[in-house]
Interface confidence: medium
């Protein structure tokens, strides 16, 4: 079989948007199954027609309604003949149109009066492609060959730039790039103390506007009174916008404020935020826990706990915990140093403990008091010790 791309030059140049019909002539076969191939891949196009010129001469058509850049490439036709694939001479389809941008100017954020560059590149065909730069509505500089780099010495306000690409088919305009001025960041906001203990505080905040420059760090300043002596200053890399303040004094009033910085410098500080560390839990356990049996139940008594340090704050109430070996257990809170215990089983051993609490929590538990089911009273001692008389 003889194959040729009919009347087709080796190169076929078509304007973008125009229709194209490629013709393939097959001689020496009665019923050729003509396939079209583009750049090595079979073309799945249902607009393929066949004309029988004679019994042994066929013409196949590949019809493209409106060519675009992606249709450009190397085309050939092929037929199966006796188990072998015969291919025609290729035709190079070139699609010409207005320039096509491969690189367009990008938005930038720059410090005032700092130099910067913008890039623009466009291709044909047809070549050559020339680039003209625009600053706002003003043309800057004469045509330059593509690709083109625009060097700008600096701007003092937000400015628009675009490029225009020209070739024999016409011109194309790029996107408009906005060059913003960088500025100092805005103050942070929503500053919250998220967790508090007697010596630590966790702080979180929302960053203000970054001034179009990446925020690099934030500073948390801590004082014991707004505007007082600085107790602590912590510089943290961001994100995340959080900080842990350590080694604070318990039960103390503090204030903190935060500012964040970008490459140009720091933001103003946010307003002071007051907070108070928690006090310490009581350090001592109640002493001399003992029990007195009565007809109505069991009276428990212990010695009052005196605060060891002012940081413990006011003490009280006391918390009493008791358990029996039948699994019964309970807790009760009492204001004084004496408690009347009811609801327990006198036939079972009883273990009692007491602690004193404050706003922070309960102090250490006292030595456990074991009240034996045989005792008329009980005394402190190791758990499971029994005293009877």
């Amino acid at each position: 079989a003889g194959l040729k791309l009919m009347g087709a030059p080796v190169k076929l140049t078509v304007s973008q948007g125009q229709p194209v019909k490629l013709n393939c002539s097959v001689e020496g076969m009665e019923e050729p199954d003509i396939q079209w191939v583009k750049d090595g891949a079979v073309v799945q196009n249902l607009d393929q027609l066949y004309i029988p010129v004679s019994e042994q001469h066929w013409i196949g058509f590949l019809s493209l309604k409106s060519v675009e850049r992606s249709d450009a490439g190397r085309y050939w036709c092929q037929v199966e003949d006796g188990g072998e694939t015969e291919i025609s001479q290729p035709v190079w389809l070139t699609v010409e149109g207005v320039p096509f941008f491969t690189v367009e100017p990008k938005d930038l954020a720059v410090p005032p009066n700092a130099p910067f560059q913008l890039s623009c590149e466009a291709v044909g065909p047809p070549e050559p492609v020339t680039i003209v730069w625009w600053r706002g509505t003003t043309k800057i500089g004469g045509p330059a060959p593509s690709p083109s780099v625009l060097n700008v010495t600096g701007v003092t306000q937000s400015t628009m730039f675009s490029c225009e690409a020209h070739n024999l088919k016409g011109l194309a305009s790029s996107r408009t790039a906005t060059v913003h001025l960088q500025a100092l960041p805005a103050a942070p906001f929503n500053i919250t103390v998220t967790k508090l203990s007697s010596s630590n505080a966790s702080v979180a905040w929302m960053p203000g506007a970054d001034g179009r420059a990446l925020l690099q760090s934030c500073t948390v300043q801590v004082t014991q009174a707004p505007g007082g002596w600085e107790v602590l200053a912590v510089v943290v890399p961001v994100p995340p916008f959080t900080c842990l303040l350590r080694d604070l004094v318990p039960a103390t009033n503090y204030s903190l404020r935060v500012r964040c910085a970008n490459a140009l410098g720091p933001s103003p500080y946010a307003d002071w935020v007051p907070f108070q560390t928690k006090g310490l839990a009581p350090a001592s356990a109640p002493q001399n826990l003992h029990a007195i049996r009565t007809d109505s139940g069991l009276i428990l008594e212990w010695e009052e706990v005196i605060p060891e340090a002012p940081l413990e704050g006011p003490l009280g109430p006391y918390k009493l915990s008791w358990v029996q070996d039948n699994g019964t257990q309970d807790e009760l809170t009492v204001e004084g140093t004496r408690a009347n215990l009811t609801g327990w089983d006198p036939q079972k051993d009883l273990i009692v403990r007491v602690c004193v609490s404050n706003a922070v929590g309960c102090g250490p538990w006292s030595q456990p008091l074991v009240v034996s089911s045989h005792d008329r009273a009980g005394q402190q001692g190791p758990p499971h010790s029994r005293t009877s008389w």
């Epitope: 019923e31 199954d33 073309v43 799945q44 196009n45 249902l46 607009d47 393929q48 027609l49 066949y50 004309i51 029988p52 010129v53 013409i59 019809s63 493209l64 309604k65 409106s66 675009e68």
Partner: antibody
Framework: EVQLVQSGADVKKPGASLTISCQAS????????ISWVRQKPGKGLEWMGQ????????MYGPSFQGHVTISADRSTATAYLQWRSLEASDTAMYYC??????????????????WGPGTLVTVSS | SYELTQPPSVSVSPGQTARITCSGD??????AYWYQQKSGQAPVLVIY???KRASGIPERFSGSSSGTMATLTISGAQVEDEADYYC???????????FGGGTKLTVL
């Protein structure tokens, strides 16, 4: 004169298999493609797929891929549309169409000019 | 999957111009074809390759295509033109054909 003669109407139960046919005459069968088009009662036309001139290559619409098989016998100039397992939703009129391929007198393409009269398939339990 | 969108119905008086539109993303690249189907009959090709009239079709039928929209125009519609009209084209890669949903033309 170009003629496409389709097999007669058929009533089947869901799950049954079925093959309908389209016999071409009045032209060289291998000069053209054959397409199948479905039309459900009171609804529009749906392109199901086609088989090329040499019965060697088929193309299917996305909704029909895997559900039907298009084939052809060049020796009898007949195209076929086959179901392995019919569903009630297959109830429709099925047309075979002589598709683009060769051209009339080598000039004007006869795109989808010739349609068969249609085969009515009813699937009902 | 690819879709071609047509208005469900168009009404005109006899002698008026009827326009039926068909929109699809691939129409800038792929040709549109138009079919007429009268009640109980097989469809008949009216327009192929956007604007070419099929043999035996009256001159009052014309087609055009611009961007993603193809249009069938019937200049001076007749009562006998009352039918369903379908546009037909390929999806962008050319792997399969698609019919539009159809437009019922009423000539009152």
């Amino acid at each position: 004169e170009v003629q496409l003669v389709q097999s007669g109407a058929d009533v089947k139960k869901p799950g049954a298999s079925l093959t309908i046919s389209c016999q071409a005459s009045g032209y060289t069968f291998t000069d053209y493609w054959i397409s199948w088009v479905r039309q459900k009662p009171g609804k529009g036309l749906e392109w199901m797929g086609q088989i090329n001139r040499h019965a060697s290559n088929t193309m299917y619409g996305p909704s029909f891929q895997g559900h039907v098989t298009i084939s052809a016998d060049r020796s009898t100039a007949t195209a076929y549309l086959q179901w392995r397992s019919l569903e009630a939703s297959d109830t429709a009129m099925y047309y075979c169409v002589r598709s683009g391929g060769a051209t009339s007198g080598g000039t004007i393409p006869e795109y989808y000019q010739h349609w068969g009269p249609g085969t009515l398939v009813t699937v009902s339990s | 999957s690819y879709e071609l969108t047509q208005p469900p119905s168009v009404s005109v008086s006899p002698g008026q111009t009827a326009r039926i539109t068909c929109s699809g993303d691939a129409l800038p690249k792929k040709y549109a074809y138009w079919y007429q189907q009268k009640s109980g009959q097989a469809p008949v090709l009216v327009i192929y390759e956007d604007w070419k009239r099929a043999s035996g079709i009256p001159e009052r039928f014309s087609g055009s295509s611009s961007g993603t929209m193809a249009t069938l125009t019937i200049s001076g519609a007749q009562v006998e033109d009352e039918a369903d009209y379908y546009c037909y084209s390929q999806e962008r890669k050319g792997n399969y054909f698609v019919f539009g949903g159809g437009t019922k033309l009423t000539v009152l």
